[in-house]
């Protein structure tokens, strides 16, 4: 069948990084400048991604493959193919339409992306709350209270692992 | 081709008023959120203000609030920033960019940007 298809349609032999030219007897001829085919056998060429704005260029353009974007400090990729730069904010904000905001008392963001979350409600568990919560971190939840009370085993759970110089506030 | 183009910057005394405006091709400006962005010498870009597709919502930084305000003409595929009282602080390259389908429902992220213009503010 492919060797059919060879004999009656010679697009088909246009490498990628060509075009069938329908102007100049069906040859294949180089993409023109800021233009690429990835694929062989194409009557045309797609035009290169620009990446403009906050877009930053990762991979240039070539005859054979469209350039890549990801976005400029301050922003991060949403989409397939980075299609979309969103704006980051700090630790304990989520963005908003009206900008980054503060995470609401009871929740967090421990990354400069996403939404705030609330706390974990440690008694929902059974445990009781060893370190709390802040606007950039989750609360940390220790043993059930019955765990704490006289009698019971008198061995100490490990101290939660925190950043060097973060103290609970 | 998908393009925003900005224009209306410059040389611009304290107290001045410029107006930049962002003419949009290739697309229906009326279906996308708008937003104004500015990157002041040496900083990271910042966010000014935006819009929603019929005018209704605008919302700004707290440092332009009361000076600078958004709008815009769907008829002529026009997004507008009327700067008033402009100190040397707003000095910076000013960026139109279209907000990506579903723009405050899932996301904030911008899908199209122009190349800016250039405010300057001295005496």
């Known amino acids: 069948f492919e060797r059919t298809r060879s004999l009656q349609d010679p697009c088909s032999n246009c490498p990628a990084g060509t075009f069938c030219d329908n102007n100049r007897n069906q040859i294949c001829s180089p993409c023109p400048p800021n233009s690429f085919s990835s694929a062989g056998g194409q009557r045309t060429c797609d035009i290169c991604r620009q990446c403009k704005g906050v877009f930053r260029t990762r991979k240039e353009c070539s005859s054979t493959s469209n350039a890549e974007c990801d976005c400029t400090p301050g922003f991060h990729c949403l989409g397939a193919g980075c299609s979309m730069c969103e704006q980051d904010c700090k630790q304990g904000q989520e963005l908003t339409k009206k900008g980054c905001k503060d995470c609401c008392f009871g929740t967090f963001n421990d990354q400069k992306r996403g939404i705030c979350r609330p706390w974990t409600n440690c008694s929902l568990d059974g445990k009781s709350v060893l370190v709390n919560g802040t606007k950039e971190r989750d609360v940390v939840c220790g043993p059930s209270p019955a765990d704490l009370s006289p009698g019971a085993s008198s061995v100490t759970p490990p101290a939660p692992a925190r950043e060097p110089g973060h103290s609970p506030q | 081709e998908v393009q925003l183009v900005e224009s209306g910057g410059g040389l611009v005394q304290p107290g001045g008023s410029p107006r930049l405006s962002c003419a949009a091709s290739?697309?229906?400006?009326?279906?996308?959120?708008m937003i104004w962005y500015r990157q002041a010498p040496g900083e990271k870009l910042e966010w000014v203000a935006n819009?929603?597709?019929?005018?209704?919502?605008?919302y700004y930084v707290d440092s332009v609030k009361g000076r600078f305000t958004i709008s815009r003409d769907n008829a002529t595929n026009s997004l507008f920033l009327q700067m008033n009282s402009l100190r040397a602080e707003d000095t910076a390259v000013y960026y139109c960019?279209?907000?990506?389908?579903?723009?405050?429902?899932?996301?904030?992220?911008?899908?199209?940007w122009g190349q800016g213009t250039t405010v300057t503010v001295s005496s």
């Open positions: 819009i929603n597709q019929d005018g209704s919502e605008k």
């Open positions: 290739g697309f229906t400006l009326s279906n996308y959120w």
């Open positions: 960019a279209r907000g990506g389908d579903g723009y405050s429902n899932s996301h904030y992220g911008m899908d199209v």
